[in-house]
């Protein structure tokens, strides 16, 4: 007995060939004797099938002896046994129809899990393959379950059912909601604008949900809300900022932050969370600040950063084009009786400067000019 | 659900030999049978033949017989269409077509322009 | 060979209007009858088949009437996006055959 794999949804066409090239009379029934079609001289005929309205055949080459059932909208009930009768021939074919979906939505928050779940005919028992758009392979019979998606798992699910020496392939589409970076870091000098943005890593028609940044300033004792907004189909709608700082959020996609000036006191680090409607949990993002400041005060040459740095970074001050005078893992640096000139004081990491801040230093009968 | 994408332009001589393929995706294609049609510029569809699921058997329209050749490739979801002999009457564009028998072609390729010129 | 033959050939049309298309068979092809829409450089799409069912997704302002030998499409209300040459096609035996289209331009 010939066996044919179908899908959920699909269609198939199950073939039946006369050694007569021409049209003779045939008939499908099922396992039930039920005829499901045939033809009665040059028209085709239906019987009280269930498949009556998703069941066809080919007319058009009918005088060339092919006599095809034809079944559009597969079901998982349509899985039977359909018997040809033809020239006094019966050819029999075995129809298995399974469905593969993925029993959340398809939409998934980072670190939820996934299942898949495989609708299959009673009596079949096949295995599942499936292989994630990271190349991770997962098998299973029934459900196929992955924890702790990441955002790797975005993109094309392909899963094989075997089943008697034979497969048949689902491709589901997984969207991980979250955003393009879990972390970031932001270098600026005392004064400076600061621009925070929160890209997106999927896109979607609509998005809809509201969302918060709390801040915890290294010189607080606590973290405060700066500010509140809504998202309405991509839009973007602020409810409540703080007055200090007096924060600005763009209107569209990305999300994007504005402090107008980086200060000692706004330097640490906030966590934005965005609650998308319909969902369960929050997309987060964490966002640090790093704010340099160069003084004079005196005799004294100060350099100082405030904020999140890791304990590899090196602060140094140097005369410019020459050796730095002092560089230590440490955030505040300072010259005792600077000479004149313009000196730098230069954050950096592995040789790579991240920021830095000019001063000029008078002789001294004159004040310090900081450009 | 199903999609089909068709190889690229060609441009050939008269008397070469011209293959297409139609790449089936998002479906299970050894269930299907698919109709070749083609279309000269600024005129109307002109069925060339089928190939059917099992076996690959084929029915072409008489016009193309003798010169048209259907066959399928389960491995990598391909159909391919093959025409010989050609001339510049067989400029056009060369679509395939999901055939689900009487109740038409509900699938079709992008296309693909074929070009038959000395 | 079994000829189909649609008439008119070409007719203008404004939005909101109601479009009749015919198609002709050479002989009775029962309902084995379908239509399709196909704009400029686009392959065509499937609206309805045998004669009077409609296609999945396609807008209910389309209709297929007829048996026999003589069939009909018809727009009830036509939309920007219907400007385009409509086909008809038997499928009732070998070789399919096509009707020559007929373009619907707008007034």
């Known amino acids: 007995k010939k066996v044919v794999l179908g899908k959920k949804g699909d269609t198939v066409e199950l073939t039946c060939t006369a050694s007569q090239k021409k049209s003779i009379q045939f008939h499908w029934k099922n396992s039930n004797q039920i005829k499901i079609l045939g033809n009665q001289g040059s028209f085709l005929t239906k019987g009280p099938s269930k498949l009556n309205d998703r069941a066809d055949s080919r007319r058009s080459l009918w005088d060339q002896g092919n006599f095809p059932l034809i079944i559009k909208n597969l079901k998982i009930e349509d899985s039977d046994t359909y018997i040809c009768e033809v020239e006094d021939q019966k050819e029999e074919v075995q129809l298995l129809v399974f469905g593969l979906t993925a029993n959340s939505d398809t939409h998934l928050l980072q670190g939820q899990s996934l299942t898949l779940t495989l609708e299959s005919p009673p009596g079949s028992s096949p295995s599942v393959q499936c292989r994630s758009p990271r190349g991770k392979n997962i098998q299973g019979g029934k459900t196929l379950s992955v924890s702790q998606l990441e955002l790797q798992d975005s993109g094309t699910w392909t899963c094989t059912v075997l089943q008697n020496q034979k497969k048949v392939e689902f491709k589901i589409d997984i969207v991980v909601l979250a955003f393009q970076k879990a972390s970031s870091i932001v270098y600026k000098k005392e004064g400076e604008q600061v621009e925070f943005s929160f890209p997106l890593a999927f896109t979607v028609e609509k998005l809809t949900g509201s969302g918060e940044l709390w801040w915890q300033a290294e010189r607080a004792s606590s973290s405060k809300s700066w500010i509140t907004f809504d998202l309405k189909n991509k839009e973007v709608s602020v409810k409540r900022v703080t007055q200090d700082p007096k924060l600005q959020m763009g209107k569209k996609l990305p999300l994007h932050l504005t402090l107008p000036q980086a200060l000692p006191q706004y330097a640490g680090s906030g966590n934005l969370t965005l609650a998308l409607e319909a969902k369960t949990g929050k997309l987060h993002q964490e966002v640090n600040l790093v704010v340099m400041r160069a003084t004079q005060l005196q005799k004294n040459l100060t350099c100082e950063v405030w904020g999140p740095t890791s304990p590899k970074l090196m602060l140094s001050l140097k005369l410019e084009n020459k050796e730095a005078k002092v560089s230590k893992r440490e955030k505040a640096v300072w010259v005792l009786n600077p000479e004149a000139g313009m000196w730098q004081c230069l954050l950096s990491d592995s040789g790579q400067v991240l920021l830095e801040s000019n001063i000029k230093v008078l002789p001294t009968w004159s004040t310090p000019v900081q450009p | 659900q199903v999609q089909l994408v068709q190889s690229g332009a060609e441009v050939k001589k008269p008397g070469a030999s011209v293959k297409v393929s139609c790449k089936a995706s998002g479906g299970t294609f050894s269930n299907y049978a698919f109709s070749w049609v083609r279309q000269a510029p600024g005129q109307g569809l002109e069925w060339m033949g089928i190939i059917n699921p099992s076996g690959g058997s084929t029915s072409y329209a008489q016009k193309f017989q003798g010169r048209v050749t259907m066959t399928r490739d389960t491995s990598t979801s391909t159909v391919y269409m093959e025409l010989s002999s050609l001339r510049s009457e067989d400029t056009a564009v060369y679509y395939c077509?999901?055939?689900?028998?009487?109740?038409?072609?509900?699938?079709w390729g992008q296309g693909t322009t074929v070009t038959v010129s000395s | 060979d079994i000829q189909m033959t649609q008439s008119p050939s070409s007719l203008s049309a404004s939005v909101g209007d109601r479009v009749t298309i015919t198609c002709q068979a050479s002989q009775d092809i029962s309902n084995y009858l379908n239509w399709y829409q196909q704009k400029p450089g686009k392959a065509p799409k499937l609206l309805i088949y045998?004669?009077?069912s409609l296609e999945t997704g396609v807008p209910s302002r389309f209709s297929g009437s007829g048996s026999g030998t003589d069939f009909t499409l018809t727009i009830s209300s036509l939309q920007p996006e219907d400007f385009a040459t409509y086909y008809c096609q038997q499928s009732f035996s070998s070789p399919l055959t096509f009707g020559q289209g007929t373009k619907v331009e707008i007034k």
């Open positions: 077509a999901r055939d689900v028998g009487d109740r038409g072609m509900d699938v």
């Open positions: 045998k004669a009077s």
